[in-house]
């Protein structure tokens, strides 16, 4: 089904609209932040897998407005954001904007110009102060030192806003200056260090469950008195909006 | 021990270029960023620009367009290019290490070479 | 660029007197501030980085704080080696830029 444009007048209804694509599937409540290096430090090809790599991450979270939103930005001397947290838009559509977000190859891709995105746009306003906001950095370069000036206030000021960032490093180019100050900043700042694009796939589930555990379940709806005994009878709703409390993943 | 030391013509003709030779020891120019500072004589110290470890280079917008910085590290030294230089440009040009780094974020700079001193007549 | 105005521009104490300089940054800094000490021989060291962080080898006499736009460096106890001129300089922005300076002198 294609997607009909958003306006004030769209009843978008999320949550039920699409099933869990895996057995593994995140339902916390999550800002999540995709951030993938443009830099000709990947080969064409690699840049494809590592884009696969953000679908199938995708495709292991509870996407929408009510519990993980997501966004995706290219990197290079600047940033090319593609899809945005507020972006309204039904899984499969985001899924396949992420696949579709286009080889850069330039020759820096800045960290810090990126971070400072990441503080000073996507994360201003913090709109939902109950989610947890993380920012996944696909890292496969290193920016020349002079753009890295201010690499580590950026760190900071995303810490002071409550932004958990995990760096994944990526192949043999990978900064680790950065990454090591990136993990310093604070203990949720777990690095992933890999030795080239092929990792990220036996890395997924270990990143995702990662994440995962980060971020808060949703607290249960609360009901009106005269309504606290009602019961609905199995599978009338499609999929549950709340997981079960012992694990992050919806089994 | 950390040392800075600057070699230079002393004087140089209006119009002219002047280049500055800052040889270093005690420290690895991969590992440490130097910038130059002068001082016209009987006032204060005036930022002119760069050179990171890695080669990439800062420079003071208003000095930009006469302004070159460039290094040697096999040979621990940095240069220091200006072009068509004017009676103002006469000064004690100090270069300086610079703990400047992806790890470091106070841009202090820690030594000081003793400077040398250009004068700018025909 | 940001402008850095030192005061006083020159100041007479006497050994063993608690001295204070100030500097004052046309914007906020951030605490991005340092503090040089230059010797009427034309020598310059670092004294304190960071608003308040002694550089290795400072004796303790010296000290700095401030936030904001205002910032101070203080000399406990006036040696005679502490004759010399102070400059503060911010590294908040490009380009770097110092204060006028302070001229120390003994009485």
């Known amino acids: 089904p294609t997607d009909a444009p958003v306006s004030p007048t769209t009843l978008y209804v999320e949550d039920i609209s699409e099933p869990p694509l895996h057995d593994f599937y995140c339902s916390r409540l999550l800002d999540l932040v995709f951030l993938l290096d443009g830099s000709s430090r990947l080969s064409e090809a690699e840049f494809e897998v590592l884009k696969a790599f953000v679908v199938d991450m995708m495709e292991r979270l509870r996407i929408s407005q009510k519990w993980v939103r997501v966004a995706v930005v290219e990197y290079h001397d600047g940033s090319h954001a593609y899809i945005g947290l507020k972006d309204r838009k039904r899984p499969s559509e985001l899924r396949r904007i992420a696949s579709q977000v286009k080889y850069a190859g330039s020759q820096v891709a800045s960290t810090s110009e990126v971070l400072k995105y990441t503080l000073f746009q996507i994360f201003s306003k913090i709109d939902r102060p109950e989610a947890s906001r993380i920012t996944l950095l696909l890292m496969a370069s290193q920016e020349p030192q002079r753009m890295s000036r201010n690499f580590v206030r950026y760190v900071q000021g995303l810490k002071k806003k409550k932004v958990i960032v995990i760096p994944v490093g990526i192949g043999p180019h990978a900064n680790l200056k950065q990454i090591r100050l990136i993990e310093k900043q604070a203990p949720e700042n777990k690095a992933f260090v890999l030795s080239s694009v092929d990792e990220l796939e036996q890395q997924r589930d270990e990143i995702v469950s990662y994440l995962c555990d980060l971020a808060p379940e949703a607290p249960p709806p609360t009901l009106p008195p005269d309504m606290a005994q009602v019961t609905v009878g199995p599978g009338l709703l499609g999929v549950s909006t709340l997981g079960p409390k012992r694990n992050s993943m919806v089994l | 021990q950390v040392q800075l030391k600057e070699s230079g013509p002393g004087l140089v003709a209006p119009s002219q270029s002047l280049s500055i030779t800052c040889t270093v020891s005690g420290f690895s120019l991969t590992d440490y960023g130097v910038d130059w500072v002068r001082q016209p004589p009987g006032k204060g110290l005036e930022w002119l620009g760069m050179?990171?470890?890695?080669?990439?280079?800062d420079y003071n917008s208003a000095l930009k367009s006469r302004l070159s910085i460039t290094k040697d590290n096999s040979k621990s030294q940095v240069f220091l290019k200006m072009n068509s230089l004017q009676t103002d440009d006469t000064a004690r040009y100090y270069c300086?290490?610079?703990?400047?780094?992806?790890?470091?974020?106070?841009?202090?700079?820690?030594?000081w070479g003793q400077g040398t001193s250009v004068t700018v007549s025909s | 660029d940001i402008q850095m105005t030192q005061s006083p521009s020159s100041l007479s104490a006497s050994l063993g007197d608690r001295v204070t300089i100030s500097c004052s940054a046309s914007q906020d800094i951030n605490k991005y501030l340092n503090w040089y000490q230059q010797k009427p021989d034309g020598a310059v060291k670092l004294l304190i980085f960071?608003?308040?962080s002694l550089h290795s080898g400072v004796p303790s006499r010296f000290s700095g704080s401030g936030s904001g736009t205002d910032y101070s460096l203080t000399i406990s106890n006036l040696e005679p080696e502490d004759i010399a001129t102070y400059y503060c300089?911010?590294?908040?922005?490009?380009?770097?830029?110092f204060g006028g300076g302070t001229k120390l002198e003994v009485k």
């Open positions: 300089q911010q590294y908040e922005k490009l380009p770097w830029t």
């Open positions: 050179i990171w470890g890695d080669g990439s280079t």
């Open positions: 960071y608003t308040s």
């Open positions: 300086v290490r610079d703990p400047a780094d992806y790890g470091n974020y106070d841009y202090a700079l820690d030594y």
